[in-house]
């Protein structure tokens, strides 16, 4: 398949990845679908350096990332290992809080106003960040 060698219009390149920052809010699943329709995924934070980059662009606004525990354990949407990977939770988070009164706990992770992470109700309409890697082969089947 073809490889993406430069970022699409309105995306920001950083360390061989492309990032797109929303200006509106969606529920986590709708944000995830939006990124996938762009052949991308919700942002996966793998280092303190990447955390700082994303934080700089989103500012002090609740923003979804590609991390959830809707099926049990915490998982990154691109398969990056959660247990051994970078984490930046707020103290005492994630807490799967049930006290919000919206039903269920909290299964989706977002950047908070100070950049650290919190788990929250996935239906909340937060902004989001899409990410796609440069030089990654597309999903198209090879030409025969």
């Amino acid at each position: 398949g073809s490889e993406r060698t430069c970022c699409p219009v309105n995306w920001v390149e950083h360390e061989r990845s492309c990032y797109w920052f929303s200006r509106s809010g969606k529920a986590w699943a709708d944000a995830d679908n939006y990124c996938r329709l762009e052949d991308a995924h919700l942002v996966v934070v793998t280092s303190w350096e990447e955390q700082k980059f994303v934080q700089h662009h989103i500012g002090p606004v609740n923003t979804w990332m590609g991390l959830h525990d809707q099926n049990g354990p915490w998982k990154w949407v691109d398969g990056t290992d959660y247990e051994t990977g970078f984490k930046n939770w707020r103290p005492e988070q994630p807490d799967d809080w049930y006290g919000h009164g919206l039903g269920g706990g909290e299964d989706c992770a977002h950047f908070t106003d100070d950049g650290r992470w919190n788990d929250d109700v996935c239906q909340r309409p937060y902004r989001w960040v899409c990410e796609t890697e440069l030089d990654k082969a597309s999903q198209e089947p090879p030409l025969l």
């Epitope: 073809s2 200006r23 509106s24 709708d30 679908n33 939006y34 329709l37 052949d39 597309s138 999903q139």
Partner: antibody, heavy 123, light 107 residues
Framework: EVQLLESGGGLVQPGGSLRLSCAAS????????MSWVRQAPGKGLEWVSV????????YYADSVKGRFTISRDNSKNTLYLQMNSLRAEDTAVYYC????????????????WGQGTLVTVSS | DIQMTQSPSSVSASVGDRVTITCRAS??????LAWYQQKPGKAPKLLIY???SLQGGVPSRFSGSGSGTDFTISISSLQPEDFATYYC?????????FGPGTKVDIK
Amino acid sequence: EVQLLESGGGLVQPGGSLRLSCAASGFTFSSYAMSWVRQAPGKGLEWVSVISGGGGSTYYADSVKGRFTISRDNSKNTLYLQMNSLRAEDTAVYYCAKRGYSGYEDLLYFDCWGQGTLVTVSS
Amino acid sequence: DIQMTQSPSSVSASVGDRVTITCRASQGISNWLAWYQQKPGKAPKLLIYTASSLQGGVPSRFSGSGSGTDFTISISSLQPEDFATYYCQQANSFPITFGPGTKVDIK
């Protein structure tokens, strides 16, 4: 000028299969998600499926999930819809439609449509 | 799934009339709504996206408004070529859903 031209419709028996094609021109095909939307005779519009520009992500309406498969060949600027286990209720005009892109965060709306191809499922 | 309803289902009007069609979503969709016009035997044509943004080439007599669950499309002065069926569509989440349509015909 953007153009979308569907083909492959026709009469098929219940349980049969059909493959629709949509030839695109006038835009960078691989940069846009593409969709199929259908319209039963005398009825309204029903979204069927969408595929991302690179082909890596697909979504389907519940009514066709497991029976229909959307795909694309960006080297040929062509969109496909493989329809299996067809039912009478699949009878419709099938439109190929291009995802609009406004720079906003709309998930999926359609700024260009083909003329449609009629699929009739009947014994 | 998000259900879309439209009212009225049909409206009879004369050239020069102002016509307003309402679309309602079963849950909030912000402003992720599009409107299409369809004439018999033809493909739909995009008129408005993001609830109020006019698609290029669409006459300024068409306008859209609304946010959340309630939306409208208005035609300020109906022209002969505007007699058609109008559909709303939510662009917020999958599955994408359309309203049942509103037919605008000649009084």
